[in-house]
Amino acid sequence: LPAQVAFTPYAPEPGSTCRLREYYDQTAQMCCSKCSPGQHAKVFCTKTSDTVCDSCEDSTYTQLWNWVPECLSCGSRCSSDQVETQACTREQNRICTCRPGWYCALSKQEGCRLCAPLRKCRPGFGVARPGTETSDVVCKPCAPGTFSNTTSSTDICRPHQICNVVAIPGNASMDAVCTSTSPTRSMAPGAVHLPQPVSTRSQHTQPTPEPSTAPSTSFLLPMGPSPPAEGSTGD
C-alpha cells in the first residue's frame, strides 16, 4: 500500500524535513503550510490548526513562499528622474531604472545606485554591442569598406556605397562619393540603428560631446578610472 499522505500540520518523522512549501514551526513542533507569494501568515499554526494566510495590503508584497507575519513594504515611488520598469504588486517590489539614454553603472538589490550616460561612438566607430539597462555601449572601429559619420549610442558601421566611378573614396567616417548620378548599389538612406535597450526606448536628445573620451568605466572596479574605450565620447 502507498504511504499515507500527511496533511498539515503534522509531526515530521525523526530526522526528516518538511516538504516543499512547508516549514517547521518550532513552537508547535509541526510541519505547517507556507503562505503563497502575495500573502503572509496572519495566524501561525498550532498542533491542531494550519497556518492562516492573508493577502498583502496595498504597497506591500511577498515574492516567495513564506511564513512572515507582515508583508514587506514596496520601495518608495520612483523619482522623477527614474523610470518604473516593474510596478509594486502583492507579489513583487517596484523596480526603478535609469532614465532613457542612461544605464545603471552601480546596481543595488532593487533598482540602481548610480546611473551613467550611455557611451556614444564617434565618427569612424560604430556600436559593437548596444547598451542595456545595466551595461554600457561598446564601440568598435569601422572595418575597411564600412563607415559611420555620426556620434551615436545606437548607430552601427554601414557599408560604403558602391560606385561605377568613385569621385572620393570612402573612409571609416565618410561614405564614398560617386561621380555618376547614381551608384550601382547603395544602402537605404539614414543611419542603421541597433535595437534600443528598455531604458533607452524613448530616446531623448542626447549629448554629442567632442573629445574621444568616455564616461569613466571604473564604476565597478576597485580602483580609479581606467582608460576610455577607443572611439567613444563622453567627458
Epitope: 545603471c104 552601480l106 543595488k108 550616460p117 560631446p209 571604473s218 565597478l220
Partner: antibody, heavy 119, light 107 residues
Amino acid sequence: QVQLVQSGAEVKKPGASVKVSCKASGYTFTESIIHWVRQAPGQGLEWMGWFYPGSDNINYNEKFKDRVTMTRDTSISTAYMELSRLRSDDTAVYYCARHEGPYVYFDYWGQGTTVTVSS
Amino acid sequence: DIQMTQSPSSLSASVGDRVTITCKASQDVSTAVAWYQQKPGKAPKLLIYWTSTRHTGVPSRFSGSGSGTDFTLTISSLQPEDFATYYCQHHYSTPYTFGQGTKLEIK
C-alpha cells in the same frame, strides 16, 4: 534625519598627509555613495571622487588619483579621505557629500573641514 | 573634462529684482545640470537639479532652464536671504565639475 559630520580643522606641512573623516547618521551607511568635494579659499568647488562603502567601489578624479585614498569604517559609519604629498595649493575646505538617488547632484553635505598647508 | 563657465562672476542687485545667472558647458550635457547656493562659511545647498527641478523646500522664485550647453538660473524676485554665491554643476559624467561661481551682492 540625514547628517554628515566631519572632523576638525587641520594644519599640515608641505609633503605631509591629511586624513579627514565624515561620520554619517540618519540612513544606512552602506547604502549610499560618499563623494568628496573641496573648495580653495575664495575659489569654486572641485569634485575629488566618490567611494561606495557597501563594496569599496571607488572612482577618483584623475587629477587626484595618485594622491588620494578613500576608505571607510562601517562599524562606526564613517568615511575617510586621505590626501598625501600635500602642497600649499591643497589648502582648502574639504566637504563630504551624498546624493539620495542614482544621479550625482548633492542633496546632503558635511559642514566642511579646513585643511591648511603651510611651512 | 567638461568645463562649466558661469557668468557673470559677480552681480549687484536689489531686493525685488529679477536676476539671471548663466552657465555654459564645454560639451553637451543634455539636461544634467544642478544649481547650488552657498553662504560664507557654510556648505553649498542644492537648489535645482536636472536643469529645472526644484529641490524639496526651495522657493518657487528659483527656476532653471536650458539644455545641451546653455543653462540659466533665474530668481524672479530677490529676497534678502538670496544674497549668496551660486554654482552650477553638471551631473552628466565623471569628473563632475562646477562653475566658478556667481557672487550675488546687495546694490
